[in-house]
């Protein structure tokens, strides 16, 4: 969370960022919030990148100039137009790259005042896990695959049973490029498995972390998946 | 209510250069990206290339260096040329708006001019 | 580039029933594809965009749903009007890209 302060005359604004993670290839948000004002036509928001000449996006006298936008965000940012008097100044940014990690400054300027806050944006890939028992291994066994990491992550197992026991004797984990040769699949193979246990598989890179659950009874399979941005907020 | 109006030649000979331009009524070029998209006789749409009102542009590299779309704002115009055409570029030729910055659907379209490349 | 392939070629579905169109992309486009509607001789007219969301003066009849790569759209109690070729088109990366297109005829 980072809050920044301006003057303008003698007035304040407020304007508040939250550092964000993108995921490569999907849409994102890049979160930004200031002091209210009911007059649209005197907002001004101004999204700009460190490092890049131009802007990143420009919102003023109710709507979009893109008139000095960097090719490399043309046609894939939008703000929240309907929610900016209520003093929401959040980018929409489309087909998040790789290329669009970095330190953005949020610039407000309003008849109250100006301010602006900066915002660490992170990119990479991070989805959510699933695991599968593996009914063609010679002994009973779990597959956990996630289809889009980046940068390569760390994978670990852990059993409700055997609290704080090492797996990497027993699992397998490989990493397969995927077409865009960016992201990879995660596949994850836990060998000798107990019934009446449950086991969970944690992906992690410094963007995300994610965890998949099995429960596997004689009587049925129960599975539950949670994934976190981590340094966010 | 926004109306384009597309205007040039129906007929180009191989190896000339297609000329064509949009008029827009109704409602001011700047603030939108506008577009050219082109549909050959019976078959799919595809799109060319867009321009801003501050002139920036992007153009299909199926088309390679062929295309330039430039914009007059004082007479509420877009056009287009394609050098060096062949027959492959016989086409009914649009032009439309987009939509917003962000949706990138096209939501007025003029009525299509069809440019025939023949000698 | 990305590729949109559509599904079927050709449509037959008869008046007040539901016809279901079938738009694939290459790669996930997230939600960013459009749908349109185009009649002989006229310019295509543009129905879903975000690819759900219905454009101005849509009828409520029109609905498109999916994300990703698999996009349908659907048109509930067909009217004789509905009868064309239909278009998806996906903005998420550039260039813009169109797919091959569906014939709705009347059964």
């Known amino acids: 969370l980072i809050i920044g302060f301006g003057i303008s005359g003698k007035h304040f604004i407020t304007v508040t960022t939250f550092t964000s993670a993108g995921n490569i290839g999907e849409d994102g948000t890049l979160s930004c919030t200031f002091e209210p004002d009911i007059k649209l036509n005197g907002i001004v928001i101004q999204w700009l990148k460190e490092g890049i000449k131009g802007l990143v996006h420009e919102f003023k006298e109710g709507k979009d100039d893109l008139s000095q936008q960097h090719e490399m965000f043309r046609g894939r940012t939008a703000v929240f137009a309907d929610q900016v008097v209520v003093g929401n100044a959040s980018l929409r940014l489309k087909n998040v790259q790789l290329t669009d990690a970095g330190t953005y400054t949020c610039y407000i300027r309003t008849s109250k005042g100006k301010g602006n806050a900066n915002l660490e944006y992170k990119t990479g890939a991070f989805s959510m896990p699933e695991i599968n028992v593996d009914y063609n291994a010679s002994s009973e066994s779990l597959r956990c695959e996630a289809p889009r990491w980046f940068p390569q992550p760390t994978v670990a197992w852990a059993s409700q049973v055997d609290q704080g026991a090492n797996f990497s004797e027993v699992s397998n984990t490989s990493f397969e490029l995927n077409s865009e040769n960016v992201t990879m699949k995660v596949v994850s193979v836990l060998y000798n498995v107990t019934i009446n246990n449950t086991y969970s598989c944690m992906i992690e890179n410094d963007i995300a972390k994610a965890t998949g659950d099995i429960k596997v009874t004689d009587s049925e399979v129960k599975r539950r998946s949670q994934l976190q941005l981590l340094n966010s907020g | 209510q926004v109306q384009l109006q597309e205007s040039g030649p129906g007929l180009v000979k191989p190896s000339e250069t297609l000329s064509l331009t949009c008029t827009v009524s109704g409602g001011s070029i700047s603030s939108y990206y506008w577009s050219w998209i082109r549909q050959p006789p019976g078959k799919g749409l595809e799109w060319i290339g867009y321009i801003y009102y501050s002139g920036s542009t992007n153009n299909n590299p199926s088309l390679k260096s062929r295309v330039t779309i430039s914009v007059d704002t004082s007479k509420n115009q877009f056009s287009l040329k394609l050098i060096s055409v062949t027959a492959a570029d016989t086409a009914v030729y649009y032009c439309?708006?987009?939509?917003?910055?962000?949706?990138?659907?096209?939501?007025?379209w003029g009525q299509g001019t069809l440019v025939t490349v023949s000698s | 580039e990305i590729v949109m392939t559509q599904s079927p070629a050709t449509l037959s579905v008869s008046p007040g029933e539901r016809a279901t169109l079938s738009c694939r992309a290459s790669q996930s486009v997230s939600s960013n594809l459009a749908w349109y509607q185009q009649k002989p001789g006229q310019a295509p007219r543009l129905l879903i965009y975000?690819?759900?969301t219905r454009a101005t003066g849509i009828p409520a009849r029109f609905s498109g749903s999916g994300s990703g790569t698999e996009f349908t759209l659907t048109i509930r109690s067909l009217q004789s009007e509905d009868f064309a070729v239909y278009y998806c088109?996906?903005?998420?990366?550039?260039?813009?890209?169109f797919g091959g297109g569906t014939k709705l005829e009347i059964k």
């Open positions: 088109q996906q903005y998420h990366n550039w260039p813009l890209t």
């Open positions: 975000g690819a759900s």
């Open positions: 439309a708006r987009v939509y917003n910055n962000y949706d990138w659907g096209f939501d007025y």
